[in-house]
């Protein structure tokens, strides 16, 4: 059973992930972002189901494409280089979902834009955080 300290750690990691995703979304939605039109042409895949930490596998598998999209944006829109930002997110996601269990992600049929994709995972983080508090 999860201890209060492990729950707190999970909550903090989710909050960190949430802030990173929100920062990316804000950077992309910046009205000065000249690459937004092109960014919106990139297709992202959404999970059929995202209710547990193991479903973060679906986010992890989209982090490569996410890094490529962020490479299009002006670096000043973000505090970190895309490579470093995605590296940080990968560390958090790996700690949250664990590396031992090999969960195969199931994707929804419909693809999403980067904005829809980020909003989906922001909602996921908020939902899990709310169950922990």
């Amino acid at each position: 059973a999860p201890t209060s300290s492990s729950t707190k750690k999970t909550q903090l990691q989710l909050e960190h992930l949430l802030l990173d995703l929100q920062m990316i979304l804000n950077g992309i939605n910046n009205y000065k972002n000249p690459k937004l039109t092109r960014m919106l042409t990139f297709k992202f895949y959404m999970p059929k189901k995202a209710t547990e930490l193991k479903h973060l596998q679906c986010l992890e598998e989209e982090l490569g494409p996410l890094e490529e999209v962020l490479n299009l944006a002006q670096s000043k829109n973000f505090h970190l280089r895309p490579r470093d930002l995605i590296s940080n997110i990968r560390v958090i996601v790996l700690e949250l979902k664990g590396s031992e269990t090999t969960f195969m992600c199931e994707y929804a049929d419909e693809t999403a834009t980067i904005v829809e994709f980020l909003n989906r995972w922001i909602t996921f983080c908020q939902s899990i955080i709310s169950t922990l508090t």
Epitope: R38, E61, Y107
Partner: antibody, heavy 123, light 107 residues
Amino acid sequence: QVQLVQSGAEVKKPGATVKISCKVSGDTITAYYMHWVRQAPGQGLEWIGRIDPEDDSTKYAENFKGRVTITADTSTDTAYMELSSLRSEDTAVYYCTTITFLYTRELRWFAYWGQGTLVTVSS
Amino acid sequence: DIVLTQSPATLSLSPGERATLSCQASQYISNYLSWYQQKPGQAPRLLIYSATSLASGIPARFSGSRSGTDFTLTISSLEPEDFAVYYCLQHYSTPYTFGQGTKLEIK
């Protein structure tokens, strides 16, 4: 169906420069990141680098930096890979291949390949 | 750089037999691994992507699996046209790296 057609075989002397082309047909080149991979005779595959033809941004493998230049001409849907200061170890078949994030998940991998261009470096 | 180690270097089997090819990553790469088949004088052909997904036009006898940093390509029942060299590739981070290859030959 996307096809990649590469230029013909080249024979070069050590120290020379070679420039190989890769023409995309069946779609526009700007939909793809164009990658280059090489294979020495009887050896495995080695990633050289890639270009985003939309904005000409490039990424190169560390061991090719300074010697390789990847470019693209969107008006002709053609990518180029130029390798300078050639040495005998550069004798290999050079392939262009693609990645795209605009279509299916499968096409995020090296799904389309050129037929390969043999570059022979010999004195 | 991420190193991919393929084993065995050569696998000698007969048509109809089951082939199991291994690829081990030097660090965690999630499912960012694909498998390619290459025949002499030809370009590589994508077989499996994202560790377990079958590429379009590839027969169902090919399958991929993953356990941690260990990846496996299985050919359930070998056909004569399956004898070739197989490579794994990681897309987790640049530089993208390939395994050294496994040659599948007729016994």
